[in-house]
């Protein structure tokens, strides 16, 4: 499999058959698949060097792995997008052997003197062809030469089979399955041959191709493949339940932010709640996690403005649940990214010198910002797309807080909507879905560059649109939701999570 290890070295060779038998639409589809693969790999913070070859009678090398920009995913994607099927129109035979020889030439080194680290570089060949080679001879011989060059299968104690993966995608109206199978790697419990039909569900294909065991701790990563559970798609999501004898129970959401901490809303708890009465579950697991302590933001005080006629005051409505035992990360339990951390800098593919302010400008620009939250409906986790009103609609969004029960007498809305809040909901630019009571404490998320970054914690809403946990279809335009802006509580997060190796900026 493609081992996505951010500290490893990898060359990926994209080889695309542009011969007559492929056809223009299949060629375009194959290109799209490769663009998606480049993006998927880049989302892991991995920077492989790419080689890009198209071929028919002759190969054409568009990108060499030795080029400075070959590890720049955006640049490689641009080169790929500029390739036309017509480029091989005049000489449209199928010489797969010559194309693979072009790959061999990129792998090999001058004067037989291997560069430092050659033996730690993994090589992945992704060949898109119909397998109908009609000139140049059998391409399998070049695969053998490549194996020889990389010293694969020659040392009994160190076969190095994981240093070469050959994936073959059958494209075109007619595919020679025998030829395709012969070229692809054969490894136990792995799939290296894919058909056109598979390309309709690329996430499923990538799930078969990628080994992410070295990057399970990466924040904000998800799998969207069809066989995936809700928690493959939202691996950070935590369900919180507080049992109060004779008072029933309170349900909230939270987000895994590190191996020991879940971030949620402070209002989910009271000062009387004992740790043993708080149930937290992650990854869709039945068992509850043991809790060591709940840490409230020191400035949170729900009764802080009672004298001023404000029954409930949600400023600084954030809490961290510290777990007794370390979480074991896997595909259904992973952290979400937090603002102003090194992990988020990498997730957004920003330079290492990026400041907290620059992250804020990237994630929360002064405009309507597409975001999402996760809600549970009929025992299923679903993503709800909303817009954070952070531009010209911000004022009107915040003013609608006056329609919240108990806030109708508030003279100055900034008394309840402090600078700590982000506002969503309403009907412009689109009709936003609203949060339900049970969504409180869950993350408000910005999805960028295939990664998920938490920018807020769901706190309170103007209108209860969820009678009996069923969302009403028709809701008033003033149905707004308010979320604690994580950029505004960073000193507290940084202090409480200082031992979690998140690399706060």
């Amino acid at each position: 499999k493609i081992v996505l290890d951010p500290s490893g070295s990898m060359n990926i060779y994209l080889v695309l058959d542009g011969s007559d038998s492929i056809g223009a639409s299949n060629f375009t589809g194959a290109k799209k698949c490769l663009v998606n693969l480049i993006e998927k790999v880049a989302s892991y913070g991995v920077k492989p060097r790419y080689g890009l070859v198209t071929y028919a009678t002759y190969p054409k090398i568009w990108v060499k792995v030795s080029e400075a920009d070959s590890s720049n995913a955006d640049w490689v994607t641009k080169q790929l997008n500029e390739i036309n099927y017509e480029d091989h129109k005049l000489k449209s035979g199928t010489n797969t052997k010559k194309a693979l020889q072009a790959v061999y030439s990129m792998m090999s080194w001058p004067d037989d003197v291997p560069p430092e680290g050659w033996n730690r570089t993994r090589h992945v060949i992704i060949l898109m062809t119909d397998g109908l080679h009609n000139m140049g001879g059998d391409p399998i011989t070049v695969i053998d030469e490549i194996r020889d060059l990389l010293y694969i299968g020659k040392d009994r104690k160190n076969p190095r089979e994981d240093y070469l993966d050959v994936y073959v995608f059958g494209v075109g109206p007619l595919v020679n399955q025998v030829n395709i199978n012969a070229l692809a790697s054969k490894k136990d419990n792995e799939q290296h041959v894919f058909k056109v039909k598979d390309m309709e569900n690329l996430e499923d294909v990538f799930y078969q191709m990628i080994d992410e065991s070295q990057s399970l701790s990466l924040c904000g990563m998800v799998w969207e493949h069809r066989k995936g559970t809700d928690y493959h798609k939202q691996p950070w999501q935590a369900k919180i339940s507080v049992i109060r004898p004779s008072k029933g129970h309170e349900s909230c959401m939270g987000a895994v932010v590190s191996e020991y901490f879940v971030l949620t809303a402070a209002h989910c708890f009271t000062v009387d709640d004992k740790e043993h009465s708080i149930k937290v579950s992650v990854g869709g697991e039945k068992r509850d996690l043991e809790i060591e302590v709940v840490l409230f933001h020191p400035n949170y005080n729900i009764n802080g403005k009672k004298e001023a006629g404000i029954p409930e005051f949600y400023d600084y409505d954030v809490a961290l649940i510290k777990l007794k035992n370390k979480l074991k990360y896997g595909q259904t339990i992973r952290p979400i990214c937090l603002p102003c951390t090194e992990g988020t800098t990498r997730a957004l593919r920003l330079p290492p010198t990026t400041t907290c302010q620059q992250q804020k400008e990237e994630l929360l620009p002064a405009q309507d910002i597409k975001a999402l939250f996760v809600s549970e409906e009929e025992k299923k986790l679903t993503r709800k797309e909303v817009y954070i009103k952070n531009g010209d609609k911000k004022g009107s969004c915040e003013r609608d807080a006056q329609y919240a029960p108990g806030y109708d007498k508030v003279k100055d809305i900034s008394e309840v909507v402090t600078p700590r809040f982000l506002c969503t909901g309403g009907v412009s630019p689109y009709a936003d879905p609203n949060t339900c009571r049970g969504d409180s404490g869950g993350p408000l998320i910005v999805h960028k560059r295939s990664r998920f970054i938490q920018v807020g914690v769901i706190s309170w809403g103007v209108v209860d649109v969820c009678k009996n946990q069923k969302r009403q279809k028709q809701v008033p335009a003033h149905a707004r939701d308010f979320h604690i802006n994580l950029f505004q509580v960073l000193p507290w997060l940084k202090e409480k999570l200082q031992d979690e190796d998140l690399g706060f900026l």
């Epitope: 291997p114 033996n119 010293y151 040392d155 104690k157």
Partner: antibody, heavy 121, light 111 residues
């Protein structure tokens, strides 16, 4: 056809130095471990050391009895293995064989004819 | 280091008889499902010759009367029916752990 030919043996005084060579042909030299094995007169075989193949950067390993005194090196452009022997002792007297160590099964499948080193005053 | 002990030191047999040579290792020479034990034959004035590799695999060009068996620490070289040219010294050698080591040898002589 695989061939290994040792040279450089001879008579040397205790404390002296000698360099043995092993010229090879018929196989891809850099892809193999290459070992030196010695045999004292009337005694059994004793492994001296080896140079690993290219994946391991041709790093070396030695028997305790020669460590610090003997150095194995190779010139891949000449397909030749060397054994530099310093601070020689009388107990180093032996026939020195060079052998190809096949990483496909970690056994010495081809041997040279050997070269005699005599350490005596 | 792994010490290899061969027995017997000398074995006197007649042509046509079956020879069984033993080699015991001070610790296991197995790794990842393979036993890294090899057997060599050496005749006077000649270089050693590989007979068996990885405990039981016959090197190409070696007659089928030679066979190897064993795993872990106990290994056996068997010659099913001795031919006159089989009388020589036999060495076992482990290549599982550095440094490589040889047994002291078993001399197979004509009775």
């Amino acid at each position: 056809e695989v061939q290994l030919v040792e040279s450089g043996g001879g008579l040397v005084q205790p404390g002296g130095s000698l360099r043995l060579s092993c010229a090879t042909s018929g196989f891809t030299f850099r892809d193999y471990y290459m070992s030196w094995v010695r045999q004292a007169p009337g005694k059994g075989l004793e492994w001296v050391g080896f140079s690993r193949h290219r994946v391991y950067g041709y790093t070396t390993e030695y028997a305790a009895s020669v460590k610090g005194r003997f150095t194995i090196s190779r010139d891949n452009s000449k397909n030749t293995l060397y054994l530099q022997m310093n601070s020689l002792k009388t107990e180093d007297t032996a026939v020195y064989y060079c052998a190809r160590d096949n990483p496909g099964y970690y056994a010495m499948d081809y041997w040279g004819q050997g070269t005699l080193v005599t350490v005596s005053s | 280091e792994i010490v290899l002990t061969q027995s017997p030191a000398t074995l006197s047999l007649s042509p046509g008889e079956r020879a069984t040579l033993s080699c015991k290792a001070s610790q296991s020479v197995d790794y990842d499902g393979d036993s890294y034990m090899n057997w060599y034959q050496q005749k006077p004035g000649q270089a050693p010759r590989l007979l068996i590799y990885a405990a039981s695999n016959l090197e190409s060009g070696i007659p089928a009367r030679f066979s190897g068996s064993g795993s872990g620490t106990d290994f056996t070289l068997t010659i099913s029916s001795l031919e006159p040219e089989d009388f020589a010294v036999y060495y076992c050698q482990q290549s599982n752990a550095d440094p490589y080591t040889f047994g002291q040898g078993t001399k197979l002589e004509i009775k």
